[in-house]
Amino acid sequence: SIPWNLERITPPRYRADEYQPPDGGSLVEVYLLDTSIQSDHREIEGRVMVTDFENVPEEDGTRFHRQASKCDSHGTHLAGVVSGRDAGVAKGASMRSLRVLNCQGKGTVSGTLIGLEFIRKSQLVQPVGPLVVLLPLAGGYSRVLNAACQRLARAGVVLVTAAGNFRDDACLYSPASAPEVITVGATNAQDQPVTLGTLGTNFGRCVDLFAPGEDIIGASSDCSTCFVSQSGTSQAAAHVAGIAAMMLSAEPELTLAELRQRLIHFSAKDVINEAWFPEDQRVLTPNLVAALPPSTHGAGWQLFCRTVWSAHSGPTRMATAVARCAPDEELLSCSSFSRSGKRRGERMEAQGGKLVCRAHNAFGGEGVYAIARCCLLPQANCSVHTAPPAEASMGTRVHCHQQGHVLTGCSSHWEVEDLGTHKPPVLRPRGQPNQCVGHREASIHASCCHAPGLECKVKEHGIPAPQEQVTVACEEGWTLTGCSALPGTSHVLGAYAVDNTCVVRSRDVSTTGSTSEGAVTAVAICCRSRHLAQASQELQ
Amino acid sequence: QEDEDGDYEELVLALRSEEDGLAEAPEHGTTATFHRCAKDPWRLPGTYVVVLKEETHLSQSERTARRLQAQAARRGYLTKILHVFHGLLPGFLVKMSGDLLELALKLPHVDYIEEDSSVFAQ
C-alpha cells in the first residue's frame, strides 16, 4: 500500500506496511532550485521555506496565461518527493526553495548561477548543518555552470542534479556533466530506464546512479491535498537528494566523496536492462539504482571504491584520455579500454599534485578510455613504481618495495603499436602477489599504498579458450581496487571494474583462433582495511 | 564526469586590435576564450557571463565591468551590467551586443566569456 518508488529505495529491514525509516533527514537543509511552489500544500506545509530569490525569464508567447497551479507544478511535486509528509523520502528534512524556472519550466544559466551564489552567501552568513542542493534542471554543456557547481561542492555543499530527459549522453548537458555534482538518471517500477515520449533518461559516464523516476506520486499544486504522478530525471534526482539528506542526518560529518561512495555502495546493482542504452554507452553507464543504507551507522569500516571513466580520447594517433578521482579520493589503480583493441595501455601520472589515470590511443585505433579506480582510504600514502621495458624474455616486473606498502593496482603502457601480436602470454610467477608483470616492451606501473591496516591480495581467473569477457570478483568483505588483464593476450580490448568485479573484454571470439593466443586471464586486486573495521567497532 | 570535456562550442577570438593597444591586453601568454551552447535553439545571444580569473576581487570585477561599459560607449554601444558575481565565481553578467565580444575578451582579468543559454525543468 505504499508507493512503489518508496518501497524500491527502502531496504527490506524497514519494509513494513509503512515507509518509516529512522531519522528523516532532520539535521539537513535541502535547497531546491526550480519553479515556484505551493508551500501550503499538506505534504510540505511548514517544511519548505520559500526564499525571496527569483530570477526567471519571461514566458514565451504573447497569449501565455499564468495559472498559479501550473506555475507551481514541478517544484511542488519535487519538494513533496524530497520531504513530503506522506509520500516523501526524507520526511524530516527542511527545504528552502529558489525560483529559477518560470511557469513554462524554463530558466537561464545566468539565473541558476545567481541562485547558486545566493546559496553560498546564505551559507556564509548563517552556517547551518549539512546542505544539499537539488538542481532538477538541465541545459546544454556550460563551462560556467559546471565551474560554479564545482566551487559550491568544494565549499562542502552536496549538489544533486537530474541527468536530463533527452535520451542522450548526460555529458552533453549541464549541470549533469559537472564532476562534483551527483548526477541521477531515471528508472521505472521494473528497474528499466525511463522512456519519456520519444526521449527518455540520459545515460553515460556522467551519470552517477539511477533512481525511481516514472509514475512518482507526489504533491500536486492543483489543490492543497491533491497528489499527482509525474515522471522524469528530476523526480529521480529528488529521491537521491532525499536519501542524501537521510545519510547526512545520520552522519553529518560525511564529505561529498564519502556520500557519493556510500550512495553507490548501497545501490541495487545490475538490475537495469542495459539493452535500452546505445551500445557504445552501455559499458560507461552505471548499472545502479539508489537505495537507503540498511542501517544508518556502521558503514565506516568498509573500504569504498568506485569506477570513473574518462571522456573518449578521440581517434588521433597520439590521443590520450584522462580519468580523475575526486579531491578526497585516492587513485588506487588505472586501466584502459578500446573498442577496436588498438591502444597503447595506460599509466598513472602526477598532475597538479594528484595522481591521474591516462590511457593512450594507438595508430589506427578509434580511441581509448581511461578507467580510474577511486577509493576512500584515510591516511593513505600512495605512490607509483615504474619499471621501464625489460630486455629479458621473462618480461617487465615491478613490485612494492617500500616497507608496509601493498600493491593496489597494475598498469602497463607501451610505445610499439602492435605489442604482443605474435608473442605467447607471460605468466605471473606464483607466490609473488605484490608484483606487477608485463611485456618486455612495456613499462609497468605499480600502485603502492600504505594505509593503517590495509591488506590486499591478488585473485586471477583464466579461461583457456577464447572468450569475449572474463570476470573475477572479490569476495565478501574485500573491495576491488585493481583490475587488469594478464599480459600477452593481444586481442584484449581492455579491463575495467564494475562494482566488485574485474571485467576483461576481448575481441569478438569469432575473429580469434583457439590457440594459446586466445587464453584470457583477468587479474583482480582485492583489498580491505582492518583499521577501518576496528575504528568502526570502537564506535559501536 | 570531466569538466573540460563537453560538446560545447568554443570560439577563440583573435586578440589583435590596433584600436585598444597593449595596455588593454590580458596578462601575457593567456587567451580568454568564448563559449556558447552547442544547442542553437537554447542560446540567448545578447547576454553574457564574463568570468574573471580565480583570485579576482569584487572591486576588480566591478572595475572591469565599468571599463567594458566605458569602452563600449566610446564605440557607440549601450551595455547593461545585470549582476556582479562574487562568492562563487568572480565576474559579471552583461547585456550587450555580440559585436563587443572581441573587446570584452581583451579586458584584464578575463578568463572566459560564456553566452547565456536556457535551462529546463526535467
Partner: antibody, heavy 126, light 106 residues
Framework: QLQLQESGPGLVKPSETLSLTCTVS??????????WGWIRQPPGKGLEWIGS???????YYNPSLKSRVTISVDTSKNQFSLKLSSVTAADTAVYYC??????????????????WGQGTLVTVSS | EIVLTQSPATLSLSPGERATLSCRAS??????LAWYQQKPGQAPRLLIY???NRATGIPARFSGSGSGTDFTLTISSLEPEDFAVYYC????????FGGGTKVEIK
C-alpha cells in the same frame, strides 16, 4: 464496512481542554490510503474542518484553530484523538470524526470526507 | 481562506419538483468541490465529489456541475427523503464548507 464512533465528555468547563476519541472499526487506521479528520458543527450552524492526521502521525490543522488543536493517533488501538485547549462557549458544537482519502494511493477513492461518525455534542459551560 | 456562499438559504419545493442549489467560491477552486446531504440528527453524507462525480450508492437524480467559482447541485425530481440541508465543500485550499441550503417541503 467501515464505521467511526466518537467518544468523550459531553460537558467541558471554559478554559479547560476538550478531549475526544474516535474509534475506527471494520478497517485499519494504519492504511497509507487515508487521513482521519475532525469536523465540528455549532448548533444550527454550518460545518468547520478542525484538522486531520495520517497513520504516521503527520498532522495538518485549520489555520484558525492551529494554536489550540492537537490530533494524535494510536494505531495499536485503531483510534485517533482530538484535544482542543482553552475552550470557550463558542466551541460548543457537535464534533464529528471522518475518513479522508490521502491521495497517496489514488485507487483508494475520492479525496473527500466519507464516511463520518454519528457525532457527539460537546457543551462548554461552567 | 476560500469562502463558499450557498444560495438560496432555504428552498421550498414539492416532491417531484426539480431543485437547483448554487454554491459560489470567493476564488477559483477548479473542480475541487463536493456536496453533502445532512438530515436532522445525522452526520453529513457525501453525494457529489470533484464537482460532478456521484459518490457510491447515490441515486442518479443527484447531479453536480460547474468549475472555477460557480457550482450547481441539481435534484431532478425530489423524493420525500431528499428534504434535508445540503452543504458544499472545497479542497482547493485546505477545507471550507458553505453555509448550507435547506430544502424543505412546500
Amino acid at each position: 464496512q467501515l464505521q467511526l464512533q466518537e467518544s468523550g465528555p459531553g460537558l467541558v468547563k471554559p478554559s479547560e481542554t476538550l478531549s475526544l476519541t474516535c474509534t475506527v472499526s471494520g478497517g485499519s487506521i494504519s492504511s497509507s490510503s487515508y487521513y482521519w479528520g475532525w469536523i465540528r458543527q455549532p448548533p444550527g450552524k454550518g460545518l468547520e474542518w478542525i484538522g486531520s492526521i495520517y497513520y504516521s502521525g503527520s498532522t495538518y490543522y485549520n489555520p484558525s484553530l492551529k494554536s489550540r488543536v492537537t490530533i494524535s493517533v494510536d494505531t495499536s488501538k485503531n483510534q485517533f484523538s482530538l484535544k482542543l485547549s482553552s475552550v470557550t462557549a463558542a466551541d460548543t458544537a457537535v464534533y464529528y470524526c471522518a475518513r479522508e482519502n490521502s491521495g497517496v494511493v489514488p485507487a483508494a477513492g475520492p479525496n473527500w470526507f466519507d464516511p463520518w461518525g454519528q457525532g457527539t455534542l460537546v457543551t462548554v459551560s461552567s | 481562506e476560500i469562502v463558499l456562499t450557498q444560495s438560496p438559504a432555504t428552498l421550498s419545493l414539492s416532491p417531484g419538483e426539480r431543485a437547483t442549489l448554487s454554491c459560489r467560491a470567493s476564488q477559483s477552486v477548479s473542480s475541487y468541490l463536493a456536496w453533502y446531504q445532512q438530515k436532522p440528527g445525522q452526520a453529513p453524507r457525501l453525494l457529489i465529489y470533484d464537482a460532478s462525480n456521484r459518490a457510491t450508492g447515490i441515486p442518479a437524480r443527484f447531479s453536480g456541475s460547474g468549475s472555477g467559482t460557480d457550482f450547481t447541485l441539481t435534484i431532478s425530481s425530489l423524493e420525500p427523503e431528499d428534504f434535508a440541508v445540503y452543504y458544499c465543500q472545497q479542497r482547493r485550499n485546505w477545507f471550507t464548507f458553505g453555509g448550507g441550503t435547506k430544502v424543505e417541503i412546500k
